[in-house]
Amino acid sequence: ESALITQQDLAPQQRAAPQQKRSSPSEGLCPPGHHISEDGRDCISCKYGQDYSTHWNDLLFCLRCTRCDSGEVELSPCTTTRNTVCQCEEGTFREEDSPEMCRKCRTGCPRGMVKVGDCTPWSDIECVHKESGTKHSGEVPAVEETVTSSPGTPASPCSLSG
């Protein structure tokens, strides 16, 4: 690694802009919206729109703000005390087991099932069996088994990609 010093190399308090507010830690902790200095003597404010901290902490730097991905909309911006809130665009959802990406909602339920829940930013459409009322596991059905939500429209493989 090069021994050349860049601005990025320097510790957070050495790079801190002059306008960044400082205060003293309380019982070794700094309040939300701040981080602690390397020597533990100062609380340094996070940079609005760039980083944040949500709790009392002894972190050496604030947490980097999340940037919403393409396919997401920003519900609320990053502040010094709260991370950005991103949500999947209409027609897509984010699953708990794959939170890194928004997936397309299914356009309809498999044959023999009815839709009981709409596509939301956090869930796919919900399907239940007509007779038993039990939920469908959510696996994408084979194209020929699919009944679309608008009758008469042919099923499209493109709409099933997830």
Partner: antibody, heavy 116, light 110 residues
């Protein structure tokens, strides 16, 4: 560059000071860590001295080691060595990457053997 | 004290294959995780910092992912030169948290 020195054979209980000499950068800009590795074992973090000179130690290392520095050296004092302190001792420069530190520049290490 | 648990302790794979190493932190360390490669008789070499960012000169065959308490190092298109021991470390991010290392994973390339 970073280079450790002072490793030798010592008897248990005899204090020992290891020195890390740096060149090409200023210790006033960088935190420095000490890490050790017993023969055939994994890496063990001992402690760190910040750019301003404040020291922090691993929970297990408090009271057993003391880290200090001058303008070009970082010292690690092993206060009362035991045979379990036999290891290669490394010092490493901590680079600040914007939202993370990491030990990016390491010395070759110096071997300490504690034996009666 | 923070404990880093690394698995497996040893893994073997053929040239061109892929190896995955896991690292679990006993508490939330956000994205403050580094990965190191060490060969016998040498000091550790920084591969990845801040969970997924490649250190200078490290090939893109190495990749890192995760956050919070669960992290992964993946080495794809394995080369003979990748035979080494790999360590995860909670990098310095808090004045009260140890910068603990994982126990190491020996990678054997066949």
């Amino acid at each position: 560059s970073v280079e450790e020195s002072g490793g030798r054979l010592v008897t248990p209980g005899t204090p020992l000071t290891l020195t890390c000499t740096v060149s090409g950068f200023s210790l006033s800009n960088y935190a420095m860590s000490w890490v050790r590795q017993a023969p055939g074992k994994g890496l063990e973090w001992i402690g760190i001295i910040s750019s301003s000179g404040t020291t922090y130690y691993a929970s297990w290392a408090k009271g057993r080691f003391t880290i200090s520095k001058t303008s070009t050296t970082v010292d690690l004092k092993v206060t009362s060595p035991t045979t379990e302190d036999t290891a290669t001792y490394f010092c490493a420069r901590e680079t600040y990457y914007g939202y993370s530190y990491a030990a990016g520049l390491w010395g070759p290490g110096t071997l300490v053997t504690v034996s009666s | 004290a923070l404990v880093m648990t690394q698995t497996p302790s040893s893994v073997s794979a053929a040239v061109g294959g892929t190896v995955t190493i896991n690292c679990q932190a006993s508490q939330n360390i956000y994205s403050n995780l580094a990965w190191f490669q060490q060969k016998p008789g040498q000091p550790p070499k920084l591969l990845i910092y801040e969970t997924s960012k490649l250190a200078s000169g490290v090939p893109s065959r190495f990749s890192g992912s995760g956050s919070g308490t669960e992290f992964t190092l993946t080495i794809s298109d394995l080369e003979c030169d990748d035979a080494a021991t790999y360590y995860c470390q909670s990098s310095w991010h808090s004045i009260s948290t140890d910068c603990a290392f994982g126990g190491g994973t020996e990678v054997v390339v066949k």
